[in-house]
């Protein structure tokens, strides 16, 4: 019978700057129900307020909705582990939503052998910006990183794309099948996961030759 | 109210057993559990280890570790602590407390168990 | 395991004085810090948990204070029903430890 360890808040990430979620491993138990709470005060502000949604992030996770994310605030957050026998705290975690963002995979990626008559054949690759990720007002940059290989190879090529939604790959190997993603990163934050892998068939003929 | 009550005094031989049960009620005996704390003749208090009701934890005091179970029938509401390989060190006033809103807030009367040849 | 050292380990007072109880740990509790009196063929009664918070039912005149390793308790005004062994005990971390207690006598 014993208070519980003390609570780590691990992880916050933001999809798009305009909601957030926060994720805390719990300490030990002590043998006793325990309850957890997480406690948040905007930096500057002396009010203390309680997590908006425990449910919507899963298990020991705090949910902040787009009425309670400010972008240029500082979030000053910690956890509270409560049992009979007392309570224990996470050390406070310091968050600036323009930092965690780590967005959705891009989306409708396209692959497409070209073997134009005069010039060298490539390989032809299209996605889309994830959908909730809003470019046009100029709040984001995401820059983009492919990666393929042949199906049985063990080691990705990985290209860095840019900003750009296309990209071509010249060096192939005829006749392999080959597995292409794509993923995406704001110029501050963190990378998505990589896309579905998109499968394309390299032609027997296409030549790596000038 | 909240209770515990426990069984009455023993007399044992050395090298015996002795089983103390701890009747709870009063309380959601489920979401707490049963802590042992012994104090021989004229000495401090000593804790045991405790079992717990909640989810079937329990933790011993390395000196127990090899010769004390202790276990809770979330059915009968009842600890209980069993000590085997007694000698005449082990005679003492066995007391249970748990927690119920508070740490260790309610404790039991005590059961003198004595050993002796 | 932390050592818990209670000081002194016997009192004489008289009825009416105010008292305190001092009790170091061997290494930072987190103020998961009891105190109990236990009078002679009882069993310990909880005062204070939580390094100063009171009991239900406990009379103020007990107060308990400090934090990290030193801890105290105070009885402010003696009553003879008082006169009784006061032990401490962590409950910070296993194994919980008490300390060896303090035996308040009638001067």
């Known amino acids: 019978q014993l208070p519980p360890g003390k609570p780590e808040i691990f992880k916050c990430r933001s999809p798009n700057k305009e909601t957030f979620t926060c994720w805390w491993r719990p300490g030990t138990d002590g043998g006793l129900p325990t309850n957890y709470s997480l406690t948040y005060h905007r930096e500057g502000e002396t009010l203390m307020h309680e997590c908006p949604d425990y449910i919507t992030g899963g298990p020991n996770s705090c949910h902040f909705g787009k009425q309670y994310t400010s972008m240029w605030r500082t979030y000053i957050m910690m956890v509270n582990a409560t049992n009979q026998m007392g309570s224990s705290f996470s050390d406070e975690l310091y968050v600036d939503v323009t930092y965690i963002v780590q967005p959705d995979p891009p989306l409708e990626l396209a692959v497409e052998v070209k073997q134009p008559e005069d010039r060298k054949p490539y390989l032809w690759i299209k996605w889309s910006p994830p959908t909730l990720i809003d470019l046009k007002t100029g709040w984001f940059t995401l820059l983009y990183e492919i990666r393929l290989k042949p199906e049985k190879a063990a080691e990705w090529e990985i290209h860095f794309a840019g900003q750009q939604t296309e990209f071509k790959i010249l060096s192939l190997h005829p006749g392999q099948k080959y597995l292409v993603q794509v993923r995406c990163k704001p110029d501050h934050g963190y990378w998505s996961a990589w896309s579905p892998a998109t499968f394309i068939q390299i032609p027997s003929d296409f030549t790596m030759n000038d | 109210q909240v209770q515990l009550v426990q069984s009455g005094a023993e007399v044992k031989k050395p090298g015996a057993s002795v089983k103390v049960s701890c009747k709870a009620s009063?309380?959601?005996?489920?979401?707490?559990?049963i802590t042992w704390v012994r104090q021989a003749p004229g000495q401090g208090l000593e804790w045991m280890g405790w079992s717990s009701a909640y989810n079937g934890k329990t933790d011993y005091a390395q000196k127990f570790q090899d010769r004390v179970t202790m276990t809770t029938d979330t059915s009968t509401t009842t600890g209980y602590m069993e000590m085997r390989s007694l000698t005449s060190d082990d005679t003492a006033v066995y007391y249970c407390t748990t927690v119920v809103r508070r740490p260790f807030d309610f404790w039991g009367q005590g059961t003198l168990v004595t050993v002796s040849s | 395991d932390i050592q818990m050292t209670q000081s002194p380990s016997s009192l004489s007072a008289s009825v009416g004085d105010r008292v305190t109880i001092t009790c170091r740990a061997s290494?930072?509790?987190?103020?998961?810090l009891a105190w109990f009196q236990q009078k002679p063929g009882k069993a310990p009664k909880s005062l204070i948990y939580a390094a100063s918070s009171l009991q239900s039912g406990v009379p103020s005149k007990f107060s308990g204070g400090g934090s990290g390793t030193d801890f105290a308790l105070t009885i402010s005004s003696l009553q003879p029903e008082d006169f009784a062994t006061y032990y401490c005990q962590q409950y910070s971390s296993y194994p919980i430890t008490f300390g060896q207690g303090t035996r308040l006598e009638i001067k």
């Open positions: 290494q930072d509790i987190n103020n998961f």
């Open positions: 009063g309380y959601t005996f489920g979401t707490s559990g």
